[in-house]
Amino acid sequence: EICGPGIDIRNDYQQLKRLENCTVIEGYLHILLISKAEDYRSYRFPKLTVITEYLLLFRVAGLESLGDLFPNLTVIRGWKLFYNYALVIFEMTNLKDIGLYNLRNITRGAIRIEKNADLCYLSTVDWSLILDAVSNNYIVGNKPPKECGDLCPGTMEEKPMCEKTTINNEYNYRCWTTNRCQKMCPSTCGKRACTENNECCHPECLGSCSAPDNDTACVACRHYYYAGVCVPACPPNTYRFEGWRCVDRDFCANILSAESSDSEGFVIHDGECMQECPSGFIRNGSQSMYCIPCEGPCPKVCEEEKKTKTIDSVTSAQMLQGCTIFKGNLLINIRRGNNIASELENFMGLIEVVTGYVKIRHSHALVSLSFLKNLRLILGEEQLEGNYSFYVLDNQNLQQLWDWDHRNLTIKAGKMYFAFNPKLCVSEIYRMEEVTGTKGRQSKGDINTRNNGERASCESDVLHFTSTTTSKNRIIITWHRYRPPDYRDLISFTVYYKEAPFKNVTEYDGQDACGSNSWNMVDVDLPPNKDVEPGILLHGLKPWTQYAVYVKAVTLTMVENDHIRGAKSEILYIRTNASVPSIPLDVLSASNSSSQLIVKWNPPSLPNGNLSYYIVRWQRQPQDGYLYRHNYCSKDKIPIRKYADGTIDIEEVTENPKTEVCGGEKGPCCACPKTEAEKQAEKEEAEYRKVFENFLHNSIFVPRPE
């Protein structure tokens, strides 16, 4: 019997009864948060052989071994993982051994066994026989092996029953418990599983089988299960499901869901029955079970229950990630925030259509609305009082709406309103009227010419660059000296520059009023000599890198209530000169004959220009005399080079004896101080542990229902 889609057993150990008769758990198995120590001996689930996702055990009091609960669990497929892990055993206070003596395969993912104070028999299991790669396993903070005294069956009687393998240069017996060996198949089976009698299973079997070389006798399938047979691929007119079995179209159509997309049911795509179309695809019609590629970003309709979505933080913006059509109204009220412009772009940058109105008020953190970089249509199906569908009020630092040279925005219905935006030039608002098709809809008071742009130098003159000089890491630029009507109104210039691989940047990219700015800024004082053109040397730049540069004149903005003219340049794109590339990476050499060497390498990480060729140099080295000191044809052991003597197990030392020469003949060494790299590694390790623990807690703790 297939159980699923994931079983969560918590608080009450009697919930374990839900596992009765399950042969396959299609999904995960959580057993957790059972705080009262119970006697689990009466609970046994011998039918359970496969978990298709992962197994998670966390804080289950009184459970001493998993072997009695799941004596025949053979395969954990890891089709979906818990933070990259297929088996997690965390803070199991009473667990003494894992004991899953029939576990033969974890198909995908690693294991994490951490903070189990009583857990032994960890060093006796060879995980490389179960997993493809053991490098990502995390086994930390359990009972120290020295306190365990793990003994495999028969060792005490000097009649060892288990087989040996090598782990970390230690050749030892492999077992799960004091009376259960770790099963190993004969080498003749290769990668194939085997029966209890060591006969090789069919290649399509995984873990084990009840009869040799029979694809209907597998305990689990290497690829897919269909109609009692293990098959390498699903037959025609059937589809992969949950990574392990084949189902027909009717089955797929009749899956009921209680997840986000359940209004439309499951789909069939690329030979698989799945919950939703994958990224880049959309259903071919709302009732369709098939997917077609999207043109551009896939449409995602988002709806706000309360009709108006207030964006007052990054967190609230996060809810709109991926949305292309927003059904409702947007109220943007961003007073403060860190790196707000790029965060908002990340979460709201795909919105193309807003069906209601857009209102931006008291958003003092915003300099530009360019974070809504794909907005092309405001329908105005719902409007604010006064028939406004675009309303901009009291935004103290708003300077730009959008870059109208690269923006098409239509406001289908409703008027615009602008007031108390002191840095927003009226010319910018008038330009929006033209682009959006709202010109003529607004009445006189809708765009206030007195309190919009009152603190900005609006009517800008253009500053022209007069010369540019480049080297590998420097740019020198000069520009015409700007002369406003009254020279005292000109204070200084500000040069803005940044890396720009493409010629598509705008002045307001990544800029907000809280200090975040993707542009580097340099102030340039006026040259004392009126005939000298202002200029700057930008240094510390990267070789062969394109930079965007523009200059702004810093002027007094108010002269007796008249707007005065400001000045800024166009954006100039300029590339630094090429330089010597960094060294080629990962150089490998191997000999494939007595007279040839094959040398391979990867390109340098910093080419610093267009690479045209490589120079390979080589020279003959004298032969190492050490190689001739031993007769390699003799049966004696090849000598092992000894590099240092006199070291002892650090753990055995209670006080560090002081020695003058570390590693010499004068006695044991002090523990060397940790290198910066080791300290950093320890810090990262501690950080990683915290991140995992947070993930665990966030995933499994849910608030009590009211």
């Epitope: 019997e1 297939i2 159980c3 699923g4 889609p5 994931g6 079983i7 969560d8 839900r18 008769n21 399950c22 299609e26 999904g27 009717d250 089955f251 009749n254 899956i255 009921l256 869901s257 209680a258 997840e259 359940d262 209004s263 049911g265 919950q275 849910v702 229902p705």
Partner: nanobody, 123 residues
Framework: EVQLVESGGGLVQPGGSLRLSCAAS????????MAWFRQAPGKGLEFVSA????????RYADSVKGRFTISRDNSKNTLYLQMNSLRAEDTAVYYC????????????????WGQGTLVTVSS
Amino acid sequence: EVQLVESGGGLVQPGGSLRLSCAASGRTFSSFVMAWFRQAPGKGLEFVSAISGSGRQARYADSVKGRFTISRDNSKNTLYLQMNSLRAEDTAVYYCAANPRRATPDLSRYAYWGQGTLVTVSS
């Protein structure tokens, strides 16, 4: 943990109608696929109908198609089964069941079950 309580069962004449209700408490109701099963005297458990979390999709056993309608009200945490044109063979104890996330057509082992309500169709 989800608690389910069925109501609305009783004696009804053939051709008559009955509406069963199932009140759920505990976790977020909409995150469960809900179903009705029944067990006739001396018989095994039989699937009747199931409904998706939003209530937009439903599935019925062939024996009840066109006669029974399953629905849910997520704001009231309640599942319903409207039974029309009842027959003698519909006599059974009707159980309400809930399964988190989703339910495949071959799933009979739902995670949570009610105690059942008896429906008797007899003249």
